[in-house]
Interface confidence: low
Protein backbone atom coordinates (compact mmCIF):
# COMPACT_ATOMS: atom_id res chain seq x y z
CA UNK A 1 0.00 0.00 0.00
CA UNK A 2 1.22 3.50 -0.84
CA UNK A 3 1.61 5.27 2.43
CA UNK A 4 0.51 8.86 0.98
CA UNK A 5 -2.62 7.10 -0.81
CA UNK A 6 -4.84 9.75 1.21
CA UNK A 7 -8.27 11.13 -0.24
CA UNK A 8 -10.41 13.82 0.88
CA UNK A 9 -14.05 13.56 0.79
CA UNK A 10 -16.25 15.05 -2.13
CA UNK A 11 -19.39 16.44 0.25
CA UNK A 12 -22.84 17.48 -1.43
CA UNK A 13 -25.76 17.99 0.20
CA UNK A 14 -29.32 17.26 -1.41
CA UNK A 15 -32.39 18.86 -1.01
CA UNK A 16 -35.85 17.77 0.86
CA UNK A 17 -38.24 15.96 -1.67
CA UNK A 18 -41.33 17.88 -2.33
CA UNK A 19 -43.01 15.20 -1.61
CA UNK A 20 -41.80 14.59 2.25
CA UNK A 21 -42.51 18.33 2.61
CA UNK A 22 -46.41 18.48 1.60
CA UNK A 23 -46.89 15.04 3.00
CA UNK A 24 -45.27 15.37 6.53
CA UNK A 25 -44.80 19.20 7.03
CA UNK A 26 -41.24 18.15 7.54
CA UNK A 27 -38.08 18.49 5.57
CA UNK A 28 -34.93 16.42 5.31
CA UNK A 29 -31.64 17.41 3.93
CA UNK A 30 -29.17 14.47 2.97
CA UNK A 31 -25.58 14.87 3.45
CA UNK A 32 -23.21 12.91 1.99
CA UNK A 33 -19.14 12.62 1.90
CA UNK A 34 -18.01 10.37 -0.56
CA UNK A 35 -15.07 9.10 -1.84
CA UNK A 36 -12.35 9.17 1.41
CA UNK A 37 -9.80 7.25 2.90
CA UNK A 38 -8.75 6.58 5.77
CA UNK A 39 -11.45 6.34 7.57
CA UNK A 40 -12.29 9.26 9.66
CA UNK A 41 -14.16 12.17 8.91
CA UNK A 42 -16.10 14.37 11.34
CA UNK A 43 -19.53 15.61 10.04
CA UNK A 44 -21.47 18.69 11.32
CA UNK A 45 -24.84 20.94 10.30
CA UNK A 46 -24.50 24.40 10.48
CA UNK A 47 -27.80 26.29 9.95
CA UNK A 48 -27.45 30.03 9.77
CA UNK A 49 -23.95 29.85 11.07
CA UNK A 50 -24.35 28.14 13.86
CA UNK A 51 -23.90 24.18 14.34
CA UNK A 52 -26.83 22.28 14.90
CA UNK A 53 -27.27 19.14 16.64
CA UNK A 54 -30.89 18.97 17.17
CA UNK A 55 -32.90 17.04 14.36
CA UNK A 56 -29.58 15.50 12.86
CA UNK A 57 -28.92 11.46 12.52
CA UNK A 58 -25.55 10.72 11.37
CA UNK A 59 -24.10 7.47 10.49
CA UNK A 60 -22.37 5.86 13.03
CA UNK A 61 -19.60 4.87 11.00
CA UNK A 62 -18.42 5.50 7.39
CA UNK A 63 -19.26 2.77 5.32
CA UNK A 64 -17.07 0.90 2.73
CA UNK A 65 -18.22 1.66 -1.06
CA UNK A 66 -16.68 -1.30 -2.26
CA UNK A 67 -16.59 -4.04 0.47
CA UNK A 68 -14.86 -6.64 -1.21
CA UNK A 69 -11.51 -4.33 -1.47
CA UNK A 70 -8.98 -4.01 1.34
CA UNK A 71 -8.40 -0.26 0.90
CA UNK A 72 -11.63 0.56 0.32
CA UNK A 73 -12.55 3.78 -0.12
CA UNK A 74 -15.29 4.99 2.38
CA UNK A 75 -18.81 7.11 2.64
CA UNK A 76 -20.58 8.80 5.52
CA UNK A 77 -24.19 10.05 4.90
CA UNK A 78 -26.01 12.45 7.37
CA UNK A 79 -29.71 13.83 7.80
CA UNK A 80 -31.05 17.00 9.29
CA UNK A 81 -34.46 17.16 9.62
CA UNK A 82 -36.17 20.72 9.91
CA UNK A 83 -39.89 21.82 9.75
CA UNK A 84 -41.38 22.59 5.94
CA UNK A 85 -41.67 26.52 6.97
CA UNK A 86 -38.38 26.63 8.50
CA UNK A 87 -37.37 24.97 5.16
CA UNK A 88 -38.93 27.56 2.60
CA UNK A 89 -37.80 30.59 4.50
CA UNK A 90 -35.40 31.83 2.15
CA UNK A 91 -33.21 33.54 4.65
CA UNK A 92 -32.19 30.27 5.95
CA UNK A 93 -28.94 28.91 5.03
CA UNK A 94 -27.76 24.98 5.54
CA UNK A 95 -24.40 23.79 5.45
CA UNK A 96 -22.99 20.13 5.92
CA UNK A 97 -19.16 20.53 6.73
CA UNK A 98 -17.08 17.61 6.73
CA UNK A 99 -13.59 17.25 8.89
CA UNK A 100 -10.72 15.14 7.08
CA UNK A 101 -7.75 14.43 9.29
CA UNK A 102 -5.74 11.84 7.28
CA UNK A 103 -3.10 13.72 6.24
CA UNK A 104 -0.61 12.80 3.59
CA UNK A 105 3.41 12.31 4.06
CA UNK A 106 3.87 15.80 2.33
CA UNK A 107 1.40 17.46 3.87
CA UNK A 108 -0.60 18.46 0.76
CA UNK A 109 -3.57 19.47 2.60
CA UNK A 110 -2.44 22.10 5.22
CA UNK A 111 -1.68 25.38 3.48
CA UNK A 112 0.04 27.02 6.46
CA UNK A 113 2.28 24.72 9.05
CA UNK A 114 2.35 27.00 11.69
CA UNK A 115 -1.24 26.66 12.34
CA UNK A 116 -3.15 23.47 13.40
CA UNK A 117 -5.41 23.66 10.18
CA UNK A 118 -7.83 21.14 9.44
CA UNK A 119 -9.04 20.92 6.17
CA UNK A 120 -12.64 21.67 5.86
CA UNK A 121 -15.12 20.57 2.67
CA UNK A 122 -18.57 22.00 3.16
CA UNK A 123 -21.54 21.88 0.64
CA UNK A 124 -24.42 24.09 1.39
CA UNK A 125 -28.19 24.84 0.03
CA UNK A 126 -30.54 27.98 0.67
CA UNK A 127 -34.14 27.38 1.92
CA UNK A 128 -36.35 27.79 -0.89
CA UNK A 129 -39.38 30.55 -1.21
CA UNK A 130 -42.71 28.72 -1.92
CA UNK A 131 -43.07 28.10 -5.31
CA UNK B 1 -37.38 4.13 19.78
CA UNK B 2 -40.76 3.81 19.73
CA UNK B 3 -42.29 5.66 16.45
CA UNK B 4 -45.70 6.59 17.61
CA UNK B 5 -47.22 6.30 14.33
CA UNK B 6 -44.78 5.19 11.63
CA UNK B 7 -45.80 6.60 8.37
CA UNK B 8 -43.20 4.61 5.98
CA UNK B 9 -41.98 6.46 2.66
CA UNK B 10 -39.46 6.60 0.18
CA UNK B 11 -38.23 10.19 -1.01
CA UNK B 12 -36.04 11.38 -3.66
CA UNK B 13 -33.39 14.08 -3.25
CA UNK B 14 -32.30 16.37 -5.33
CA UNK B 15 -28.49 17.68 -5.41
CA UNK B 16 -28.05 21.20 -4.70
CA UNK B 17 -25.44 21.17 -7.51
CA UNK B 18 -24.84 18.94 -10.26
CA UNK B 19 -23.91 16.20 -9.86
CA UNK B 20 -24.36 12.30 -10.89
CA UNK B 21 -25.83 11.13 -7.86
CA UNK B 22 -29.36 9.92 -6.87
CA UNK B 23 -30.32 9.56 -3.26
CA UNK B 24 -33.05 8.08 -1.92
CA UNK B 25 -34.75 8.64 1.45
CA UNK B 26 -36.60 5.70 3.10
CA UNK B 27 -38.09 7.33 6.65
CA UNK B 28 -40.44 7.09 8.84
CA UNK B 29 -40.40 3.70 9.42
CA UNK B 30 -41.42 1.31 12.43
CA UNK B 31 -38.09 0.84 14.22
CA UNK B 32 -39.36 -3.48 13.43
CA UNK B 33 -38.33 -3.04 10.10
CA UNK B 34 -34.54 -3.72 9.34
CA UNK B 35 -33.08 -2.11 6.01
CA UNK B 36 -31.14 -4.62 4.27
CA UNK B 37 -27.65 -3.35 2.86
CA UNK B 38 -27.35 -3.84 -1.30
CA UNK B 39 -26.94 -6.85 -3.48
CA UNK B 40 -25.54 -4.31 -6.05
CA UNK B 41 -21.81 -3.18 -5.29
CA UNK B 42 -23.06 0.32 -7.11
CA UNK B 43 -26.04 1.30 -4.76
CA UNK B 44 -25.25 2.13 -1.16
CA UNK B 45 -27.28 1.95 1.41
CA UNK B 46 -26.84 2.68 5.31
CA UNK B 47 -27.56 0.88 8.27
CA UNK B 48 -30.93 2.79 9.60
CA UNK B 49 -30.68 5.64 12.02
CA UNK B 50 -32.83 7.48 14.53
CA UNK B 51 -33.39 11.20 14.25
CA UNK B 52 -34.92 13.15 17.33
CA UNK B 53 -36.53 16.22 16.32
CA UNK B 54 -36.31 17.61 20.13
CA UNK B 55 -38.06 20.98 19.27
CA UNK B 56 -41.09 19.23 18.10
CA UNK B 57 -41.20 16.35 20.13
CA UNK B 58 -40.31 13.62 17.37
CA UNK B 59 -38.32 10.78 16.63
CA UNK B 60 -37.81 9.08 12.93
CA UNK B 61 -35.91 6.30 11.77
CA UNK B 62 -33.95 6.78 8.52
CA UNK B 63 -31.80 5.39 5.56
CA UNK B 64 -30.40 6.42 2.99
CA UNK B 65 -29.86 4.93 -0.78
CA UNK B 66 -27.15 6.54 -3.22
CA UNK B 67 -25.92 5.68 -6.52
CA UNK B 68 -24.06 6.83 -9.84
CA UNK B 69 -25.92 5.09 -12.18
CA UNK B 70 -28.28 6.28 -14.58
CA UNK B 71 -30.71 3.79 -13.94
CA UNK B 72 -30.60 3.87 -10.39
CA UNK B 73 -34.09 4.59 -8.84
CA UNK B 74 -36.15 4.96 -5.80
CA UNK B 75 -38.60 2.08 -6.18
CA UNK B 76 -35.74 -0.27 -6.62
CA UNK B 77 -33.17 1.21 -4.36
CA UNK B 78 -34.51 -0.82 -1.41
CA UNK B 79 -36.05 -3.73 -2.62
CA UNK B 80 -34.39 -6.75 -0.35
CA UNK B 81 -36.28 -4.92 2.16
CA UNK B 82 -39.73 -5.54 2.99
CA UNK B 83 -41.35 -2.28 1.94
CA UNK B 84 -45.08 -1.63 1.09
CA UNK B 85 -45.89 -0.60 -2.21
CA UNK B 86 -47.58 1.94 -1.27
CA UNK B 87 -44.33 3.81 -0.16
CA UNK B 88 -42.94 4.77 -2.88
CA UNK B 89 -43.20 8.95 -3.42
CA UNK B 90 -42.99 10.11 -7.20
CA UNK B 91 -40.43 12.98 -7.65
CA UNK B 92 -41.54 15.38 -10.02
CA UNK B 93 -39.53 16.24 -12.75
CA UNK B 94 -39.02 19.90 -11.63
CA UNK B 95 -40.72 21.70 -8.39
CA UNK B 96 -40.93 25.22 -8.92
CA UNK C 1 1.87 16.17 20.75
CA UNK C 2 1.66 12.37 20.87
CA UNK C 3 4.24 9.91 21.54
CA UNK C 4 3.91 6.10 20.15
CA UNK C 5 5.89 3.47 21.79
CA UNK C 6 6.21 -0.25 20.24
CA UNK C 7 7.22 -3.19 22.59
CA UNK C 8 6.80 -7.40 22.21
CA UNK C 9 8.75 -8.05 19.25
CA UNK C 10 11.68 -10.65 20.02
CA UNK C 11 12.99 -13.27 18.07
CA UNK C 12 10.88 -16.73 17.46
CA UNK C 13 10.49 -20.09 15.74
CA UNK C 14 8.09 -20.86 12.62
CA UNK C 15 4.83 -21.45 13.66
CA UNK C 16 5.04 -19.17 16.80
CA UNK C 17 3.28 -16.32 18.49
CA UNK C 18 3.97 -12.63 19.71
CA UNK C 19 1.78 -9.86 20.85
CA UNK C 20 3.18 -6.69 20.04
CA UNK C 21 2.01 -3.20 22.09
CA UNK C 22 2.10 0.29 20.97
CA UNK C 23 1.37 2.41 23.80
CA UNK C 24 0.01 6.32 22.81
CA UNK C 25 0.76 8.74 25.06
CA UNK C 26 0.27 12.81 25.65
CA UNK C 27 -2.57 14.27 23.45
CA UNK C 28 -3.92 10.77 23.02
CA UNK C 29 -7.85 11.64 22.83
CA UNK C 30 -7.07 13.14 19.36
CA UNK C 31 -6.31 9.68 17.89
CA UNK C 32 -8.87 8.26 15.57
CA UNK C 33 -7.13 6.10 14.07
CA UNK C 34 -4.00 3.79 14.40
CA UNK C 35 -1.89 1.10 11.91
CA UNK C 36 0.56 -1.52 12.18
CA UNK C 37 2.76 -1.45 9.67
CA UNK C 38 5.96 -3.33 8.82
CA UNK C 39 9.13 -3.07 6.87
CA UNK C 40 11.62 -5.64 5.88
CA UNK C 41 15.55 -5.53 5.00
CA UNK C 42 15.19 -4.12 1.25
CA UNK C 43 11.79 -3.76 1.09
CA UNK C 44 9.11 -0.95 1.32
CA UNK C 45 7.36 -0.13 4.21
CA UNK C 46 3.89 -1.64 4.21
CA UNK C 47 0.10 -1.78 6.15
CA UNK C 48 -0.13 -4.76 8.44
CA UNK C 49 -3.74 -3.42 9.93
CA UNK C 50 -5.62 -0.37 10.58
CA UNK C 51 -8.16 0.16 13.31
CA UNK C 52 -10.00 3.18 13.34
CA UNK C 53 -11.91 5.06 16.30
CA UNK C 54 -15.00 2.85 15.63
CA UNK C 55 -13.09 -0.40 16.03
CA UNK C 56 -13.19 -0.86 12.45
CA UNK C 57 -10.36 -3.15 11.17
CA UNK C 58 -8.43 -4.06 8.37
CA UNK C 59 -5.68 -6.37 6.98
CA UNK C 60 -3.46 -6.58 4.21
CA UNK C 61 -3.79 -9.94 2.94
CA UNK C 62 -1.11 -12.06 4.46
CA UNK C 63 -1.97 -10.89 7.69
CA UNK C 64 -5.63 -12.28 7.37
CA UNK C 65 -6.72 -14.85 9.48
CA UNK C 66 -3.04 -15.11 11.17
CA UNK C 67 -2.72 -11.24 12.91
CA UNK C 68 -5.44 -9.47 14.75
CA UNK C 69 -5.42 -5.64 16.13
CA UNK C 70 -7.31 -4.10 18.94
CA UNK C 71 -6.86 -1.55 21.40
CA UNK C 72 -7.65 -1.03 24.77
CA UNK C 73 -9.07 2.56 25.08
CA UNK C 74 -8.41 2.61 28.58
CA UNK C 75 -4.80 1.63 28.72
CA UNK C 76 -4.44 4.19 25.77
CA UNK C 77 -2.70 0.74 24.05
CA UNK C 78 -2.96 -0.73 20.46
CA UNK C 79 -1.90 -4.83 20.10
CA UNK C 80 -1.02 -6.61 17.17
CA UNK C 81 -1.49 -10.32 17.99
CA UNK C 82 0.47 -12.57 15.21
CA UNK C 83 0.25 -16.12 15.34
CA UNK C 84 1.29 -18.78 13.19
CA UNK C 85 4.72 -16.73 12.03
CA UNK C 86 6.49 -17.45 9.07
CA UNK C 87 9.93 -16.47 8.18
CA UNK C 88 8.52 -14.00 5.45
CA UNK C 89 7.04 -11.79 8.98
CA UNK C 90 10.39 -11.02 9.93
CA UNK C 91 11.05 -6.66 9.84
CA UNK C 92 10.52 -3.82 12.11
CA UNK C 93 7.19 -3.25 13.18
CA UNK C 94 5.61 0.18 13.66
CA UNK C 95 3.07 1.55 14.74
CA UNK C 96 0.95 4.98 13.76
CA UNK C 97 -1.15 6.83 14.44
CA UNK C 98 -3.67 9.61 12.93
CA UNK C 99 -4.49 12.73 14.72
CA UNK C 100 -7.00 15.61 14.71
CA UNK C 101 -4.51 18.25 14.91
CA UNK C 102 -1.07 19.41 14.03
CA UNK C 103 0.85 17.28 13.20
CA UNK C 104 -1.39 14.97 12.59
CA UNK C 105 0.46 11.90 11.67
CA UNK C 106 2.54 9.80 13.94
CA UNK C 107 4.83 7.11 13.95
CA UNK C 108 7.14 5.30 16.37
CA UNK C 109 10.18 4.13 16.40
CA UNK C 110 9.83 0.23 15.42
CA UNK C 111 10.23 -2.93 17.22
CA UNK C 112 12.14 -5.98 15.46
CA UNK C 113 10.76 -9.38 15.16
CA UNK C 114 12.60 -11.93 13.49
CA UNK C 115 11.17 -15.52 12.90
CA UNK C 116 13.59 -18.03 12.27
CA UNK C 117 14.61 -21.67 13.44
Known amino acids: EDLKKVFPPKVAVFEPSEAEISHTQKATLVCLATGFYPDHVELSWWVNGKEVHSGVSTDPQPLKEQPALEDSRYSLSSRLRVSATFWHNPRNHFRCQVQFYGLSEDDEWTEDRDKPITQKISAEAWGRADC | PYIQNPDPAVYQLRGSKSNDTSVCLFTDFDSVMNVSQSKDSDVHITDKTVLDMRSMDFKSNGAVAWSNKSDFACTSAFKDSVIPADTFFPSPESSC | EVQLVESGGGVVQPGGSLRLSCVAS????????YGWYRQAPGKEREKVAH???????DYADSAKGRFTISRDESKNTVYLQMNSLRPEDTALYYCRALSKIWPYDYWGQGTLVTVSS
Open chain 3, 26 to 33: YDVHKINF
Open chain 3, 51 to 57: ISIGDQT
